[in-house]
Amino acid sequence: LRPSRVYKPEGNTKRALTLKDILNGTFSYKTYFPNWISEQEYLHQSEDDNIVFYNIETRESYIILSNSTMKSVNATDYGLSPDRQFVYLESDYSKLWRYSYTATYYIYDLQNGEFVRGYELPRPIQYLCWSPVGSKLAYVYQNNIYLKQRPGDPPFQITYTGRENRIFNGIPDWVYEEEMLATKYALWWSPDGKFLAYVEFNDSDIPIIAYSYYGDGQYPRTINIPYPKAGAKNPVVRVFIVDTTYPHHVGPMEVPVPEMIASSDYYFSWLTWVSSERVCLQWLKRVQNVSVLSICDFREDWHAWECPKNQEHVEESRTGWAGGFFVSTPAFSQDATSYYKIFSDKDGYKHIHYIKDTVENAIQITSGKWEAIYIFRVTQDSLFYSSNEFEGYPGRRNIYRISIGNSPPSKKCVTCHLRKERCQYYTASFSYKAKYYALVCYGPGLPISTLHDGRTDQEIQVLEENKELENSLRNIQLPKVEIKKLKDGGLTFWYKMILPPQFDRSKKYPLLIQVYGGPCSQSVKSVFAVNWITYLASKEGIVIALVDGRGTAFQGDKFLHAVYRKLGVYEVEDQLTAVRKFIEMGFIDEERIAIWGWSYGGYVSSLALASGTGLFKCGIAVAPVSSWEYYASIYSERFMGLPTKDDNLEHYKNSTVMARAEYFRNVDYLLIHGTADDNVHFQNSAQIAKALVNAQVDFQAMWYSDQNHGISSGRSQNHLYTHMTHFLKQCFSLSD
């Protein structure tokens, strides 16, 4: 038996983090995003739940909706109508999947100071939104779309085809919500509120995933979700546009699908209104290396939407899949014809391009061995975007302004030198025409949100600086965080290392690798976090490392597309390479190395443990994928192709965790899964367990009854992290 080892941070009055600190969320931070209602006005929900109005220029602020009004209907969210006459209040929030939820909605009349009575909204509603002009309401109830011209008016039913688990109007089905749209809605108002575009998803032929929900009853319920796994039948999508001024005269008009897309299985990927009578739709072939952007115009004479072939723009990848995680969306200029879009340049780096007529004639706006990440706003004279260009760190985000009025366009980094040590990872929120904007910095220091003048970039005020958090962290021994790169052969891997307080290079420490590693993900980011791994470093003296291997994002397509059609190979190989390099650094105890991950990270950690290298003593997989055949079609096929003999079945089969069951014999493996996981089905872990049992390999397992992919209920989360901590401490011979 090895002697147990206790890590004691030396001579310091500061205390180490405790697991309780993490589980209680003691050190969580706040951000401040203005809810813009004009160029210089915004709303914000205060700590005590009042809805407060702010005018930046006049410095006025006052409560427009009191917390007592909010409380009267137990409201947790709100939405002001663009004409400012009404507010919807949202209550009875009931989560469904990642983005979707149902809720009860009440409409409050600001002038009368009372709730609108008569023709009250049905409940529960799946989605509700105001028109961009006036106070029309569109909502989805029982998979059908309804329209109200005014809050007190009777509703007009736009669709009638909606049916639970079969046809979805204006809201996505499971797979589109999770893997394509990343929203709870699939309807979009035209800028003037005249037209309403929506998607109809037909899931009638999709196989059903069924799992038990145990609840408290004598018999469990069965949850049924149409869920297309790799190679299965997919949803059938159609896009319609309805004139909301006269919805009863002319029914919804279908928008045609481009010929080159419609010839085989395809996806709808996004919709962008360009002007009041021009709309842009994006489509994707089922084999996701061809994307088509189609610009369509309303033809009053035909009462139809026309999408001419010369307004189709094709984006194709020859080395992998189109886009990053999703295909990027266009940011249109004021001429309603030309647009800016991020896609790969000839060197394989994702950059902003300006498209006036054809993609072939696109003008590249940014370039370099870094990537443009997101276009925030295009105004008459400026384009605001984020990138990881500054100082060559892929895990940073800065906001840039390109003056497009100038010739040649000039570029300025808005954020690079603001709070250089504290802030290296930003996002932004712009008023309509970028007269003002808020910057939200996520770290590496304490997050801070600030308000800025859109013309001069001058800081106007601090919106949130997390002073309370700063004070409560004063007496905490936080670990030291380093972000560096290591080289192996011709490859460069960025890593983040979290080192215990009073770290001493001459001593040996246990090492825990935290991995995600999914295609187009990024783990090594310059952001602030106090979480479980922070505690493990602070209190338990464990060195933590996160490594971005091949397949991860924002370092060019050569690095990103390396994993195309062969998931489970290089992601694992690169974690192993990094561990060997860490051992060479001299402060890692080779006998005490572990790996853990969740979801895709659970897949990678499982494969790493079963790599037969002997590098790892133990590891944990939470809600792992175990075979790409078990996961969603849109995701699996994007990176792996189809699980058919003439496509990529062979690699689907030999990239499973089950195929490596024998190799788990010499490691301690903890396998964890929620039984009500709608995303990575419990089936994945059930099959790993079955394979391990069949191979007579001992392992540890924990299931969480009725928990989904996040295992996020308070009690379950506490149990999960306590259980994982015990497992790790036992593995590393650390006493309790």
Epitope: E57, T58, L80
Partner: nanobody
Amino acid sequence: QVQLQESGGGLVQVGGSLRLSCVASGFTFSSYYMSWVRQAPGKGLEWVASIYADGDMTYYADSVRGRFTISRDNAKNTLYLQMNSLKSEDTAVYYCAKDPLPPYHVNQGTQVTVSS
């Protein structure tokens, strides 16, 4: 102090037109979202139209959309309401308001009477 002075009201035939003005003083007019509201005899305040501080977004009540046009001249600190195709139900006292949202606080106003 803040002052809003409405003018331009009067008696007009059904189908006729009027242009109301509202001169602002005592505050930075160009930074304010402005609105026109009205009060018909024996009724409560009714919102009519609003305009953004920079003048490039406007909103109208359904009852006046297509007939009324709100505009502003920030150089002159003046808000306007052009009223066309007037109906008898447009009879009311019209007020301009600098409140960014309801409830609106109003001063004197200008009387508009539409007779048949």
